[in-house]
Amino acid sequence: ECGHISVSAPIVHLGDPITASCIIKQNCSHLDPEPQILWRLGAELQPGGRQQRLSDGTQESIITLPHLNHTQAFLSCCLNWGNSLQILDQVELRAGYPPAIPHNLSCLMNLTTSSLICQWEPGPETHLPTSFTLKSFKSRGNCQTQGDSILDCVPKDGQSHCCIPRKHLLLYQNMGIWVQAENALGTSMSPQLCLDPMDVVKLEPPMLRTMDPSPEAAPPQAGCLQLCWEPWQPGLHINQKCELRHKPQRGEASWALVGPLPLEALQYELCGLLPATAYTLQIRCIRWPLPGHWSDWSPSLELRTTERAPTVRLDTWWRQRQLDPRTVQLFWKPVPLEEDSGRIQGYVVSWRPSGQAGAILPLCNTTELSCTFHLPSEAQEVALVAYNSAGTSRPTPVVFSESRGPALTRLHAMARDPHSLWVGWEPPNPWPQGYVIEWGLGPPSASNSNKTWRMEQNGRATGFLLKENIRPFQLYEIIVTPLYQDTMGPSQHVYAYSQEMAPSHAPELHLKHIGKTWAQLEWVPEPPELGKSPLTHYTIFWTNAQNQSFSAILNASSRGFVLHGLEPASLYHIHLMAASQAGATNSTVLTLMTLTPEGSELH
């Protein structure tokens, strides 16, 4: 061994200086008598070594590294040997920090494993091997006086928790507990906890179960859940308070908390929930009024709330078949009476014959919003209900009566925009209770079954905006019927477009006769098209060779026109414009030449 390094300290604070010396023995005869000692930190040569020959003939080089900024590195003492660097000795240097004070020390007592589990946060990285030890002692008082020491608890490498087994614990008696951190640069200790293991007990949660329905017990109300829990038996004698949390399975709702509940409640009716909704529920408990830790949340229980019977008003409307007045088509619309009005599974139309107490005759059961049935000859009234698994809505009576009320007047309609129509009227006297407004495609596409309808509950209304099922360029028939206490008034109807289309093309012009100064033209009118408003007029335009233009306006029933005052032997361009309220379209251009003065008239 030719060389030897000694260092001021092999482990230092990161960034601190370090001094090293390397001594080369004299008996390394194969060396240059005056060898130059070089220093290397890791792979980098370090300048600044001060070399001297000592009295015993050895060579010494001393170097001071002003800042050791590597957490780990090898410092080598070297000589040039031929063309290569010969390492004579090397030492491992480490730099880091003394341990920070461990913080957030907390413990919990697990009654199943019979151990006190303590955990802490070790603080920032020291870059050095650092050991943690959980230290504790038994104490009669508030840990001011130390009793028997408890065997140190050393966590597995890298872990920041440790378990003190039951044999080292005394329940209902205080223990002093702290964490000691130690490395080559120092020792630190956490603040001491003084605790009775029972005061940090963490219980197991109860098991949630659905309550078995008993025959004599009333079923839960709508929006309610009946549930029970099975306490964790080993914790049964510990007074606890519990809390439930619940949220709908669907959607993004956050948990809602219910509590405190006594552990002993064992069963509970949770209300104020959405009806017919699947919920996830969990429970947890804590020792109380004595100190403790909350248990984990229990495994989830999934339950569905019961429905509520539909709370809706059913607006109804009916019409009889022309050929068979006993065949009735009944229409209805559910109007929610509350924000959550209950799911509707279907509808039933029924009739109770007079004199037959209790006997109800169903006429139809449907999920649709209308049904057609044969009305028994003695029936003047039927009942309509909406239903679901929880029950039915309040029955809506539908009375079939003759039209005996006064009619409304001045029914008119006008377009608001391409997808809505305003229908207005003058209310009759006396005021009706309301109106039924029906609308659907007018002729030739008219169909009774495809009509949309709405109930206007305000008898003083003088109009209604139709926004459903209105498309541009379609002719609509709108029917309004006033409704009275036990009867209705006659229906009135009006036709309207929400938006009309300009004529798609104008009729083709044909020359019928021509002379020197006149020309007779004719055309065949286009047949009327659905969605296109009727023609209001035609305009005929003609232009001479000098680009002078002339025109004449003709009424919509015109089939021809004679141009007078033309120049003989002259060229003219003529076209016809067909116009409606929605716009106008031009025909193709007809070009003609009037006859020469000596020519004969053409017929």
Epitope: S114, R166, Q233, P234, H237, E264
Partner: antibody, heavy 118, light 107 residues
Framework: EVQLLESGGGLVQPGGSLRLSCAAS????????MGWVRQAPGKGLEWVSS????????PYADSVKGRFTISRDNSKNTLYLQMNSLRAEDTAVYYC???????????WGQGTLVTVSS | DIQMTQSPSSLSASVGDRVTITCRAS??????LNWYQQKPGKAPKLLIY???NLQNGVPSRFSGSGSGTDFTLTISSLQPEDFATYYC?????????FGGGTKVEIK
Amino acid sequence: EVQLLESGGGLVQPGGSLRLSCAASGFTFSLYWMGWVRQAPGKGLEWVSSISSSGGVTPYADSVKGRFTISRDNSKNTLYLQMNSLRAEDTAVYYCAKLGELGSGSTWGQGTLVTVSS
Amino acid sequence: DIQMTQSPSSLSASVGDRVTITCRASQGISSYLNWYQQKPGKAPKLLIYYASNLQNGVPSRFSGSGSGTDFTLTISSLQPEDFATYYCQQSWHYPLTFGGGTKVEIK
């Protein structure tokens, strides 16, 4: 000092009824589970029933289920055991016990003798 | 139900002897095991709760150990006042159950 004092024992005919009481003092009665344990002459200990601090939970031994009812009056610091349809095998010394948080009988009364005989 | 089996059912020992009584549960009960001492004509007295915790006022010669299914009560040096019957009891699960008892007699 924690004390439990049973009363109400005595001789009763088979099929008869008896109500035992246990007066508690020296601790906050309403915070603790309480229980009844019996010991037939010359035999070991047998747990009979327990009751939670507020009275909501009342487990029973199978041998007395449906015949005995445990109850408590926290305002009077008193524990009760109503015994109906008594049988000869119910003959025993009945002890009232204060239960600790981990289910141990931390304090016991001196016991009251119930004899069921015709 | 959890069965508790105590052994021996009786033993004879002298003052100063070290005495060990065992109790076995038919299923795991963690540390939920309590030991009682009963003298003739008296109520039982709690010695050890939760397997190894000495009840206040109980002499330190009594100690308990074990967990799961096997438990031991040890009297390190038997005293004249220790001659009595000893019972173990589980409080892990209802119904609460006792062992059959171990009678410690003077040799």
